[in-house]
Interface confidence: low
């Protein structure tokens, strides 16, 4: 027999045995040109000394073979004696060491058996009724296909599934969607209605994330507030990466989980924009305000669960940076200005009422005054900070007030509102004899002492009523007692105490008269 023809004789070996685990398998035959055909197969097991024979039986009942030697691929023409327009049955017999192994048969019409391509190019993936829907353009001139998929997870081997028949310019497949693990899918096609025809190669991997993106397990730390009034938010622990199936490791598109940082600035609610979303890699600088921070995970199917943290306000205060002057027309605050055209947000809240909403005012963009100061004024009628109590004041600044991450803290301090001079006057001043020439003066703490950094000092004034001589004694704001020495027995004195702030002299307390009794010796 000629090598280019199918030999209509019995092959030169004994009968085949199909019960072996090794041997030929996955036979596929198809047309490769108008008159050319190809069959190929896999061989499982040791290949040394193996001879392969492609067997063919025609519909007439005549059978023939091609001897291919060690090759597992054969090309032949429509002149090789095999009917290409009628149904034929083909299989492979492999002979080695006096033993023959047989592949499963394929029954087909060779002329109609076109080698189908797998889905090529972009395979669109979406979610439909809890399942995965894949869609792709049908390869050119290959409308009418049966489609299979195979899928695996990081911990499972391939499982085969059927997409059913396709008969359009676009093809699609419904596949199972895993809730919590990534999957790798591959698709293959063959001609519709020709069960014996061969499958295409498997497509490139389609990597699909779990339906639920993983809970982002991250930790943050916040640096100290810098001199520029900003502090850096840093990521202490990266989100754990999703475990991926073998074919999705490397730069596999589609399976990525993206993490976004959602910042919500709680302070200064009167500003234009309170929330900003940015990529997790781009860790922002924050002002000293309080923030809520959420990390949101999402994949190609949308957002998943998020993790939320509260970043408390930076409570570090600067007692001297703010100047407040109270005049007949109203009150004006002065503080060291930032750059030209800066918007300031002034926020205040009575101490002890941190749960309630702070009062907030946004200035128009302003330039520094000749003294390099920025100002904010309000009238007495507005009632702002009018009550005699302690207020916590924070001032934020931004040259771009709509950009949440560009706010910085100018200062954070305390102020005693209303008539601080009168309200701060110490009460319950008492005098006790201490020795023959000294007394101890005590008083109740000024209301100003409840306001951190506001009370600069107490001043104790002692007047000798005989000579009208006056002495004044400064006392630390944390003390409420002083000893007056070098006093003379029998002389009448009056003592008064006042509480001073950095910008305001307090009102004297009611005069308290005392004298040291003259000691009469027996």
């Amino acid at each position: 027999c000629r090598t280019s023809e199918c030999c209509f004789q019995d092959p030169p070996y004994s009968d085949a045995d199909s019960g072996s685990a090794s041997g030929p398998r996955d036979l596929s035959c198809y047309r490769i040109s108008s008159a050319g055909y190809e069959c190929s197969w896999q061989y499982e097991g040791p290949t040394a000394g193996v001879s392969h024979f492609l067997r063919c039986c025609l519909s007439s009942g005549r059978c023939c073979y091609f001897a291919t030697g060690s090759a597992t691929r054969l090309q032949f023409s429509d002149q090789a004696g095999v009917s290409v327009l009628h149904t034929v049955t083909l299989w492979v017999e492999s002979w080695a060491r006096n033993r023959t192994e047989k592949s499963p048969e394929v029954t087909l019409q060779l002329y109609k058996s076109v080698k189908y391509k797998p889905p090529l190019g972009d395979i669109k993936v979406s979610k439909l009724a809890g399942q995965l829907r894949m869609e792709w353009e049908t390869p050119d001139n290959q409308v009418g296909a049966e489609v299979q998929f195979r899928h695996r997870t990081p911990s499972s081997s391939w499982k085969l599934g059927d997409c059913g028949p396709q008969d359009d310019d676009t093809e699609s497949c419904l596949c199972p969607l895993e809730m919590n693990v990534a999957q790798e899918f591959q698709l293959r096609r063959r001609r519709l209605g020709s069960q014996g025809s061969s499958w295409s190669k498997w497509s490139s991997p389609v990597c699909v994330p779990p339906e639920n993106p993983p809970q982002p397990q991250v930790r943050f730390s916040v640096e100290q507030l810098g001199r520029d009034g900003r502090r850096r938010l840093t990521l202490k622990e990266q989100p754990t990466q999703l475990e991926l199936p073998e074919g999705c490791q490397g730069p596999a598109p589609g399976v990525e989980v993206t993490y976004q940082l959602q910042l919500h600035m709680l302070s200064c609610p009167c500003k234009a924009k309170a929330t900003r979303t940015l990529p997790l890699e781009k860790m922002p600088y924050l002002s000293g305000a309080a923030y809520n921070v959420a990390v949101i995970s999402s994949n190609r199917f949308g957002p998943g669960p998020n993790q939320t943290w509260h970043i408390p306000a930076d409570t570090h205060t600067e007692p001297v940076a703010l100047n407040i002057s109270v005049g007949t027309n109203g009150t004006t605050m002065y503080w060291p200005a930032r750059a030209q055209s800066t918007t300031y947000c002034i926020e205040w809240q009575p101490v002890g009422q941190e749960g309630s909403l702070a009062t907030c005012n946004l200035t128009a963009p302003q330039d520094p005054d000749p003294a390099g100061m920025a100002t904010y004024s309000w009238s007495r009628e507005s009632g702002a900070m009018g009550q005699e109590k302690c207020y916590h004041i924070t001032i934020f600044a931004s040259a771009h007030p709509k950009k949440l991450t560009l706010w910085s803290t100018v200062l954070s301090t305390y102020h005693f509102g209303g008539n601080a001079s009168a309200a701060g006057t110490p009460h319950h001043v008492s005098v006790k004899n201490h020795s023959l020439d000294s007394v101890s003066v005590d008083w109740a703490p000024s209301l100003l002492s409840t306001c951190p950094g506001v009370l600069k000092e107490y001043v104790v004034r002692c007047r000798d009523e005989d000579s009208n001589q006056v002495s004044e004694h400064p006392v630390q704001p944390t003390e409420t007692q002083v000893t007056l020495s070098d006093l003379r027995a029998g002389v009448a004195y009056t003592v008064q105490v006042r509480a001073d702030t950095a910008w305001l002299r307090g009102a004297w307390s009611q005069p308290q008269r005392f004298s040291i009794k003259v000691q009469v010796s027996d």
Epitope: E146, D162, C163, G164, P165, Q166, D167, L174, Q195
Partner: nanobody, 114 residues
Framework: QLQLVESGGGLVQPGGSLRLSCAAS????????MSWVRQAPGKGLEWVSY????????TYVDFVKGRFTISRDNAKNMLYLQMNSLKPEDTAVYYC???????RGQGTQVTVSS
């Protein structure tokens, strides 16, 4: 035009069986794969099973494997779902679906309760 009519639903006790049927018309039934889906009260659609056009390939969602069997009779244009060992969580409206274009019937109610 394409029409799918489900029947065979009803009330059954846990552990019991039902056989759902779907009569197809208006298309070449034997050329298309078919699916069963279900919708439990207050929930979305849930895919249950698929059978290829010739009936050679069948596939099931994990939680019905071994209990449900899909089959078809292309000569009669009929699709079936044999449901055994039914559980209360199988309570739903069951629909048969044309797997290529997603058309479905009006559904049949299955209630599993003691």
């Amino acid at each position: 035009q394409l029409q799918l009519v489900e029947s065979g639903g009803g009330l059954v006790q846990p552990g019991g069986s039902l056989r759902l049927s779907c009569a197809a018309s208006g298309f070449t039934f034997s050329s298309y794969g078919m699916s069963w889906v279900r919708q439990a009260p207050g929930k979305g659609l849930e895919w249950v099973s698929y059978i290829s056009a010739g009936g050679g390939t069948t596939t099931y969602v994990d939680f019905v494997k071994g209990r449900f069997t899909i089959s078809r009779d292309n000569a009669k244009n009929m699709l079936y779902l044999q449901m055994n060992s039914l559980k209360p969580e199988d309570t739903a409206v069951y629909y048969c679906v044309h797997a290529a274009d997603g058309s479905r019937g009006q559904g049949t109610q299955v209630t599993v309760s003691s």
